[in-house]
């Protein structure tokens, strides 16, 4: 249960640097595991809790995407033709786009076990935690699933396809006024 999760991340007290330090134990082990679903509501299933992306600061998330996340997605896809994969995942508005982005980025899927430790994923998680009210607490409460990153990352074709879908979702997120095709 939640107590076990919090027990695994207890904070130790230390003195240091004239200020104060309290270090989270096994902080890299903290992650999230949610079921992979597609919703058009802007809600993310999280056990019995649904995260609603409606109140996020979309402009600041967009700025983070344009300045850095987009570049990391391109780096991940380097060596892949832009026409190689068809976009099969779509979103209708900004909250819905973030729901799909969250789902594809952090939920394990068949053939692509985890993208969560990729740089674009870490930055996505940071952006959501900072600019989506209450999002960080849902991550603290979430079931621990993301284990420490392996030394060697395996990029499967399925993962490339998934990241290609993510690029499409992010592009759609940046153009919310466009009519759905």
């Amino acid at each position: 249960g939640l107590n076990d999760i919090f027990e695994a991340q207890k904070i130790e007290w230390h003195e240091g640097g004239g200020g104060s330090e309290q270090k989270l134990i096994s902080e890299e082990d903290l992650g999230s595991s949610h079921h992979h679903h597609h919703h058009s509501s802007g809600l993310v299933p999280r056990g019995s809790h649904m995260y609603d992306f409606t109140n996020c600061d979309f402009e600041k998330i967009k700025a983070a995407y344009l300045s850095t996340i987009s570049k990391d997605l391109i780096t991940y896809m380097s060596g892949t033709k832009s026409t190689e994969f068809n976009n099969t995942v779509s979103c209708s508005n900004r909250p819905h786009c973030l729901t799909e982005i969250q789902s594809l980025t952090f939920n394990p899927t068949a053939g692509c076990a985890s993208l969560a430790k990729e740089m674009f994923a870490m930055k996505t998680k940071a952006a959501l935690a900072i600019w989506c009210p209450g999002y960080s607490e849902t991550q603290i409460n979430a079931t621990q699933a993301m284990k420490k990153a392996r030394k060697s990352k395996v990029t499967t074709n399925k993962c490339l396809e998934q990241v290609s879908q993510l690029q499409g979702l992010w592009r759609r997120f940046n153009r919310p006024l466009l009519k759905q095709q």
Partner: antibody, heavy 120, light 107 residues
């Protein structure tokens, strides 16, 4: 061991600027945002803003927008907070504090504080 | 901006007594509240995070509870080193804000 070491006390004239530094060590700098919090004499804590090294961006409390500039030098793991157009009400202790952006999400380490005195 | 109001402003108690500190948010913030202790001339020290989560190294006489808009920090039996100022903080949304503070003083 995690340490946040801030620069020393400053005495400034009204209308001038001050730049306070916060050198971090003992952890991966980009895994944490660096927040700045100030405390006027005998008063409570006031969040000023943050720099998020992972995203290379800042965010501010509107009360300080335009006067505060929060930056960082990732190569030296040092964060900076510059406050311009100083007035006597800016006399305060300024703290830096780290907060995880992909885990923990709480200010679990603080600098020792930097006293800035604004006086003519 | 979310306003956090702490009460009482000052709590005068004797060592060994129970202290109950309140923090009320101007809007629901689920469990995104943390508690800090501050002594004169020192930086704040994290005591409780996400409303009720305890921290190793912090005595278990400190406990937190609440969700939504009402939060409580309880010190079950006051020790001499517990006399200080206590602040609640919300990280539900930017700008992050702190409570007005409660001073726990020796009666």
């Amino acid at each position: 061991q995690v340490q946040l070491v801030q620069s020393g006390p400053e005495v400034k004239k009204p209308g001038s600027s001050v730049k306070v530094s916060c050198k971090a060590s003992g952890y991966i700098f980009t895994d944490y945002a660096m927040h700045w919090v100030r405390q006027r004499p005998g008063q409570g804590l006031e969040w000023m803003g943050t720099f998020i090294p992972l995203l290379d961006t800042s965010d501010y409390n509107q009360n300080f927008k335009g006067r505060a500039t929060i930056t960082a030098d990732k190569s030296t793991s040092t964060a900076y907070m510059e406050l311009s157009s100083l007035r006597s009400e800016d006399t305060a202790v300024y703290y830096c504090a780290r907060m995880g952006v992909t885990h923990s999400y709480v200010m679990d380490a603080w600098g020792q504080g930097t006293l800035v005195t604004v006086s003519s | 901006e979310i306003v956090l109001t702490q009460s009482p402003g000052t709590l005068s108690l004797s060592p060994g007594e129970r202290a109950t500190l309140s923090c009320r948010a101007s809007q629901p913030i689920s469990i995104s509240v943390h508690w800090y202790q501050q002594k004169p001339g020192e930086a704040p020290r994290l005591l409780i995070y996400f409303a009720s989560q305890s921290i190793s190294g912090i005595p278990d006489r400190f406990s937190g509870s609440g969700s939504g808009t009402d939060f409580t920090l309880t010190i079950s039996r006051l020790e001499s080193e517990d006399f200080a100022v206590y602040y609640c903080q919300q990280t539900f949304s930017l700008p992050y804000t702190f409570g007005t503070g409660t001073k726990v003083e020796i009666k």
